[in-house]
């Protein structure tokens, strides 16, 4: 049988002689040269040669493990005399053992990493990895150890994992943002003679909110005219924050001062400035100077840095209100006056007052805007603002008069103001009630006494406070011997009733009834209206069939019914 162990060969042998691999040997070999050893298979006769007498195998060339890690060869032992094999042809392996001829190579030539500033010592930053093409199963040729060549004392690297961590407390981005760390990977477990490779790690400290906003000055002063409408920007203030991005965002607010209700502050998101704006109308004559306490604060605060102090700052803002020549100001936004419709010309209705709000208190003159009183019904005393009538009024023509009064500074006619006057004309009982319509009705020849032939309604242009109360009666001249009677219903209506049984249209075809309508107001007003009653022939239902020669306009509901 064959006697051998597994063969090993060191790659990239640099000696001048052939490299000895091992010996093929059969237990049939007596050492007398009767056996011949033959080598075939991978690289036989080329890479590997055999001494056919001794079975010694040598490598003729410099081998590289990475070309082929294993060579499989075949061995034969033949009896020289008979030419027959004394052993079965067998295969054996020559394993190429790796030498440390490959340095570790990092997966990246340059790594980029970030870590938050002020991180605790030992915070993970990034992991670097180096690979070694040598055989990891043999020796330490591929065992890589990491170390830091540049970047201490700020960072450290775990020797086995390549994990880079922070090594210094309170690294402040505002102090230094960029670090260049050089990491070495060395094989042979980092021992002497190991091969090494390096990589650069560019580490950037990212911002955290560890700085509060700060006003560059403690006091700001701005001026604004008293005429500035709400929303007008007065001035800008800016606090600075050493942080960046979201951590440098600032919110401004007014926390104190007499101007708390009069002014606002809004944050300009683009410039991070606080814009002071007018909130309410200002009045130089009331208050000339305001002071505000404005606060700048970070909206996003990291609780772990609160020990550094409050993340806000405040400044005093002094606002000087500048005087503006203002037009006169009326004592009211609008005036409502009343006057009876029977008022005589030159009757005073009321008065308006306007004052110059400026310190100068310029005198004022009053006038009526004639575009609002084209008929010149009213006038005003230019000195004292008294309003009086210049024409007679009629409530029934116009109930409300809406006019505009102008107040003008005498010394500066450009400064003027206007105010609306609403003048209500009060009712006086100056109209008599009258029929609501023209009444023309009929009565059947065979009508019975006390039969209702018409209901009367009245209207009155006046508008008494307690409502209309009309009374109806026959005119005195027709009251005696009338063929009809008036029944006052006490509800502002009256009925015409027949006073006898039967009428003869041939005797009397038409009756004219004078009716007096009176109101119940002071002074009492009354009028007389005439109702025309025609005598007609009717059917047994009471429906009109024919009247006297004149045609009768027959309004709805004139049928006498039962």
């Amino acid at each position: 049988s064959w006697m051998w162990n597994q063969f090993f060969l060191l790659e990239e042998y640099t000696g001048s002689d052939y490299q000895y691999v091992g010996k093929l040997h059969s237990d049939q070999d007596r050492g007398d040269g009767s056996l011949k050893y033959i080598l075939s298979g991978d690289g036989a006769g080329d890479l590997f040669i055999i001494n056919e007498n001794t079975g010694d195998i040598q490598a003729t060339k410099r081998l590289d493990r990475e070309e082929k890690p294993v060579y499989i060869l075949r061995a034969q032992a033949i009896n020289r005399r008979t030419g027959r094999p004394v052993e079965p042809e067998s295969e054996f392996i020559i394993k190429i053992h790796d030498i440390n001829d490959n340095e570790p190579i990092f997966t990246k030539e340059v790594y980029t990493a970030t870590v938050p500033e002020m991180s605790d010592v030992g915070t993970f930053v990034v992991q670097v990895t180096a690979t070694d093409a040598d055989d990891p199963t043999y020796g330490n040729s591929a065992k890589v150890v990491y170390s830091i060549l540049q970047g201490q004392p700020y960072f450290s690297v775990e020797s086995e994992t390549g994990i880079i961590k922070t090594a210094l407390l309170n690294m402040d981005r505002e102090n230094r943002e960029q670090y260049q760390v050089v990491i070495q990977a060395k094989d042979m477990g980092g021992q002497m003679g190991g091969l090494s490779g390096t990589t650069t790690v560019n580490i950037t400290l990212t911002d955290v909110n560890d700085n509060p906003p700060r006003f560059p000055q403690s006091t700001y002063q701005f001026k604004t005219p008293e005429s500035s409408p709400p929303g007008t920007p007065i001035g800008r203030i800016k606090a600075s924050d050493a942080d960046v991005g979201e951590n440098a965002e600032i919110e401004y607010s007014i926390t104190d001062g007499e101007g708390l209700d009069m002014f606002d502050v809004i944050t300009d998101q683009e410039t991070q400035e606080g814009i002071i704006t007018v909130k309410k109308l200002l009045d130089f004559e009331k208050k000339k100077v305001y002071t505000l306490k404005v606060e700048a604060s970070n909206p996003y605060v990291e609780p772990r840095f609160l020990y550094l102090g409050p993340f806000k700052d405040s400044a005093t803002v002094r606002i000087v209100v500048e005087d503006v020549d203002e037009p006169p100001v009326f004592s009211k936004l609008a005036y409502i006056l009343q006057i009876r419709e029977d008022a005589q010309i030159n009757t005073t209705i009321g008065s308006v007052t306007a004052q110059d709000p400026d310190a100068a208190r310029n005198p004022v003159k009053y006038s009526v805007d004639r575009h609002t009183d084209m008929d010149r019904i009213f006038n005003i005393d230019s000195g004292n603002g008294s309003i009086f009538t210049s024409k007679l009024l009629d409530r029934e023509t116009l109930l409300w008069h809406n006019i505009t009064v102008i107040a003008t500074e005498i010394n500066n006619p450009k400064q003027s103001s206007r105010v609306p006057l609403y003048i209500k004309v009060l009712d006086v009982n100056d109209n008599a009630p009258e029929f609501a319509e023209f009444y023309e009705t009929f009565v059947c020849e065979k009508a019975k006494a006390d039969q209702l032939i018409q209901t009367l309604h009245a209207v009155d242009k006046d508008d008494p406070y307690s409502g209309h109360q009309f009374s109806f009666s026959l005119a005195p001249e027709a009251a005696s011997g009338s063929n009809f009677t008036i029944q006052d219903n006490k509800d502002n209506t009256a009925g015409i009733l027949t006073r006898k049984n039967g009428y003869n249209r041939h005797e009397m075809s038409t009756y004219l009834l004078p009716v007096v309508i009176s109101d119940n107001d002071y002074p009492v007003q009354s009028s007389t209206g005439t109702v025309t009653v025609r005598v007609c022939a009717c059917d047994h239902h009471g429906n009109m069939q024919s009247c006297h020669a004149e045609a009768l306009i027959h309004p709805t509901g004139l049928s006498t019914g039962a």
């Epitope: 991978d42 990475e66 070309e67 499989i72 067998s90 295969e91 490959n102 093409a133």
Partner: antibody
């Protein structure tokens, strides 16, 4: 001329078995190490297994280890691949290839391939 | 263990030079072989031991290997060169590793 011819492919259910053959001609079969390589539909080449010239040494890809067995019969100039416990992911064209020392232990030539489909 | 990475596709105009790369950590220390595979056919060895051409392979095929990249170059590319190309090397012990393959399109 040097030729390799695979056979034995076909449709088989998951969990089933199949035996592939590769008949060699035109060279001294017993002097060469042989390999099986497969190619799933539309995918790249994947090495499967190796056998030395006399069959003393075999080696397998992790994906088939314990399920496939490579063998050879030098007297019949034939290479075999016994495939057991087949899975859907074993569906591929299977090629046999000769390892040629003269070409730096590259694969030359290759057989035309045989298709194995594992499906229920 | 070495891992070989190839671009999925490369395009070239006829007559131009096509370069197909195969990258792996320290690949220069490994011998690389290249195979051509046309649709429906078995692979064919076109370059062995980094830069050697088997008999019958046109001279326009050449190879190189340095650093972390091995390259197959086809100069004066012809329409018939349109195929999939694979790089291959020996891995640990007796295992073999292939690249993912590159589809060469001749426009």
């Amino acid at each position: 001329q040097v030729q390799l011819l695979e056979s034995g492919g076909g449709l088989v259910q998951p969990g089933g078995s199949l035996r592939l053959s590769c008949a060699a001609s035109g060279f001294t079969f017993s002097s060469y190490a042989m390999h099986w390589v497969r190619q799933a539909p539309g995918k790249g080449l994947e090495w499967v297994s190796f056998i030395s010239s006399l069959g003393s040494y075999t080696y397998y890809a992790d994906s088939v280890k314990g399920r496939f067995t490579i063998s050879r019969d030098n007297s019949k100039n034939t290479l075999y691949l016994q495939m057991n416990s087949l899975r859907a992911e074993d569906t591929a064209v299977y090629y046999c290839a000769r390892e040629t020392a003269g070409y730096g232990y590259a694969f030359d030539p290759w057989g035309q391939g045989t298709l194995v489909t594992v499906s229920s | 263990d070495i891992e070989l990475t190839q671009p999925p596709s490369v395009s070239v105009s006829p007559g131009q030079t096509a370069s197909i790369t195969c990258s792996g950590d320290n690949i220069r220390k490994y011998v690389v072989h290249w195979y051509q595979q046309k649709p429906g056919q078995a692979p064919v060895l076109v370059i062995y031991r980094d830069n050697n051409r088997p008999s019958g392979i046109p001279e326009r095929f050449s190879g190189s290997n340095s650093g972390n990249t091995a390259t197959l170059t086809i100069s004066g590319t012809q329409a018939e060169d349109e195929a999939d190309y694979y790089c291959q090397s020996w891995d640990s012990f007796l295992a073999v590793v292939f690249g993912g393959g590159t589809k060469l399109t001749v426009l």
